[in-house]
């Protein structure tokens, strides 16, 4: 297992609709054809997996159908979007990149993007 540098923004504020996007960029030492990207959330010392996708270079990222993540890739950059976020989802979102094929296997973990989420103000009741 060889180490690889992964860069991501330090802080991002999600939109009022609970959507946060950020770029995860990795310094690929070779010509990988198969890459796996995992988003981890660290909050209160606990780390949980948010979503993961494996893709072939040049192809779209494919997350599971029920995933809250979507993404696109371009060269050594992955543009990740996390949807359906609420204030309670505020936390550090860490990008983990694995170059699966061809060997050697490389692993890189970013410092994390602190995502802040604000719940939208409830709409006042309307009489129709």
């Amino acid at each position: 297992c060889k180490a690889m540098h992964v860069a991501q923004p330090a802080v991002v504020l999600a939109s009022s609709r609970g959507i946060a996007s950020f770029v995860c960029e990795y310094a690929s030492p070779g010509k990988a054809t198969e890459v796996r990207v995992t988003v981890l959330r660290q909050a209160d010392s606990q780390v949980t997996e948010v979503c993961a996708a494996t893709y072939m270079m040049g192809n779209e990222l494919t997350f599971l159908d029920d995933s809250i993540c979507t993404g696109t890739s371009s060269g050594n950059q992955v543009n990740l979007t996390i949807q359906g976020l609420r204030a309670m989802d505020t936390g550090l979102y860490i990008c983990k990149v694995e170059l699966m094929y061809p060997p050697p296997y490389y692993l890189g973990i970013g410092n994390g993007t602190q995502i802040y989420v604000i719940d939208p103000e409830p709409c006042p009741d309307s009489d129709f």
Epitope: A10, V11, S15, T90, Y116
Partner: antibody, heavy 116, light 108 residues
């Protein structure tokens, strides 16, 4: 090295607006946020809100909602804070700070005096 | 909104003495998001401690932070003349972020 340089002191009349700038250097501007904090004479620090330089999204303190607007110009790595309908109790030193998420670097402060 | 309450408001001590400053949050705050700042007259605040206990770059070892949940402490082990200032705690946990009202450390 990281630096935040703010615009100079302003004197404004009640009801007017003020726009303070904060020019960042020494780091990747869009990777961090910029927060604004003010301090009235002899008082403590009051958080005003912040802007995510990565996407331009903003969040303001409840008491300033509707009167404050924070923006960034990523081409010049500059953040702006505009405060409208100024009142005498808006007289304060206004600071910008880099959000990472802790406020690890601060501008030198801009004194805004509101007086008729 | 999480309210941060600092005590005491003023601490009168002599150089060389140990200073213990308290910060209490109205709701539990993850220690990763608690910071302390020092401010001297006419100057901008300076980050001292983040993550409740990690010293910022260039901060002397006499400054230490501790605590978790709702109770946090800043300790200055042996006050130096340049340490007489106002100290603020702050959380950047959930929005909105808030500061404590400050503790002034003055010469006795």
């Amino acid at each position: 090295q990281v630096q935040l340089v703010q615009s100079g002191a302003e004197v404004k009349k009640p009801g007017a607006s003020v726009k303070v700038s904060c020019k960042a250097s020494g780091y990747t501007f869009t990777s961090y946020g910029i927060s604004w904090v003010r301090q009235a004479p002899g008082q403590g620090l009051e958080w005003m809100g912040w802007i995510s330089a990565y996407n331009g999204n903003t969040n303001y303190a409840q008491k300033l909602q509707g009167r404050v607007t924070m923006t960034t110009d990523t081409s010049t790595s500059t953040a702006y804070m505009e405060l409208r309908s100024l009142r005498s109790d808006d007289t304060a030193v206004y600071y910008c700070a880099r959000v990472g998420p802790h406020f690890d670097y601060w501008g030198q402060g801009t004194l805004v005096t509101v007086s008729s | 909104e999480i309210v941060m309450t600092q005590s005491p408001a003023t601490l009168s001590l002599s150089p060389g003495k140990r200073a213990t400053l308290s910060c209490r949050a109205s709701q539990s705050v993850s220690s990763s998001y608690l910071s302390w700042y020092q401010q001297k007259p006419g100057q901008a605040p300076r980050l001292l401690i983040y993550g409740a206990s990690t010293r910022a770059t260039g901060i002397p070892a006499r400054f230490s932070g501790s605590g978790s949940g709702t109770n946090f402490t800043l300790t200055i082990s042996s006050l130096q003349p340049e340490d007489f200032a106002v100290y603020y705690c702050q959380h950047v946990y959930h929005l909105p972020w808030t500061f404590g009202q400050g503790t002034k450390v003055e010469f006795k």
